[in-house]
Interface confidence: low
């Protein structure tokens, strides 16, 4: 087993929102489960964007998951990872 | 059974300070964003502050930032609310409450039988 | 700020009648409203989350609609049990605002 590494970015969109993208890369094997969460708890799928699990050429696998969100409230949400019975989360930069 | 139980209201003159404390069973504490909130003597209610579960995250109405610190202790089960330069308008009754978590997303699904806070000199 | 605007602040209805409450978002909210029932002398409980949800033990003659800026709750077959103070509360961002209350009685 090879754990994610996980890392999140932002950038500036529409109307006062920012898009958020959680990126995760390195991992084996491929089954992860990668989302993001508002106030500790999952948004619904029809917010989130899912980038498929490509393999990254060493063996390894990457994906991302992207959300839209009102500039102000970057505190409010983490993404999640699982992977292999280990989970983590990850704050949106400042 | 979830429960929520107030504690630590009175009557306080103004510019005094006040611990609240909510003690919670019946659920896994850590789990969920904890909540206070008051109704004012006109039964209007008025969000007050938010604290995250693991990741400590507060948030606070802009009538008490500054003065008013939530707290949290996982290990005890406890939620608490410090409230300090009271004012006349910080006179209430005051809840606690539980954070909806993945089974009401964005509520507030569980109150306690608050604590009456009652600013006057 | 996001402001909740509440309508009516009071009604009254016969039993039986079918009610609706609507609650007003100044901002898109989304989904992220709920409803709140506080009868006189107890605490608010939990009716509806996320617009359209019954929470548990609720009676289905509750309801809720709405999505973006617009919500109502509705409650059909008034019961003497649902004599109360109705509230809604978005959920959207900070800081969470509540509605100003609409007081239910019966004619």
């Known amino acids: 087993t090879v754990p994610p590494m996980v890392n999140v970015t932002r950038s500036e969109a529409s109307e006062g929102n920012i898009t958020v993208t959680c990126r995760a890369s390195g991992f084996y094997p491929w089954n992860i489960t990668l989302s993001w969460r508002q106030d500790g708890v999952s948004l619904s799928h029809d917010t989130q964007q899912w980038g498929d699990v490509l393999p990254d050429g060493n063996g390894t696998y990457q994906t991302w998951v992207a959300t839209r969100i009102c500039q102000g409230e970057e505190q409010r949400f983490t993404c999640y990872m699982e992977h292999s019975g280990n989970h983590s989360t990850h704050p949106v930069p400042s | 059974e979830v429960q929520l139980v107030e504690s630590g209201g009175g009557l306080v003159k103004p510019g005094g300070s006040l611990k609240l404390s909510c003690a919670a069973s019946?659920?896994?504490?850590?789990?969920?964003?904890m909540y206070w909130v008051r109704q004012t003597p006109e039964k209007r209610l008025e969000w007050v502050a938010t604290i995250s579960d693991g990741i400590t995250y507060t948030y606070y109405s802009d009538s008490v930032r500054g003065r008013f610190t939530i707290s949290r202790d996982n290990a005890e089960n406890t939620l608490y609310l410090q409230m300090s330069s009271l004012k006349s308008e910080d006179t209430a009754m005051y809840y606690c409450s539980k954070g909806g978590g993945s089974t009401a997303r964005g509520a507030l699904d569980f109150w306690g039988q608050g604590t009456s806070v009652t600013v006057s000199s | 700020d996001i402001q909740m605007n509440q309508s009516p602040s009071s009604l009254s209805a016969s039993l039986g009648d079918t009610i609706t409450i609507t609650c007003h978002a100044s901002q898109n909210i989304h989904v992220w409203l709920s409803w709140y029932q506080q009868k006189p002398g107890n605490i608010p409980k939990l009716l509806i989350y996320g617009a359209s949800h019954l929470h548990t033990g609720v009676p289905s003659r509750f309801s809720g609609r709405g999505s973006g800026t617009g919500f109502t709750l509705t409650i059909s077959s008034l019961q003497p049990e649902d004599i109360a103070t109705y509230y809604c509360l978005q959920g959207q961002s900070y800081p969470l605002t509540f509605g100003s209350g609409t007081k239910v009685e019966i004619k």
């Open positions: 019946g659920f896994t504490f850590s789990d969920y964003y």
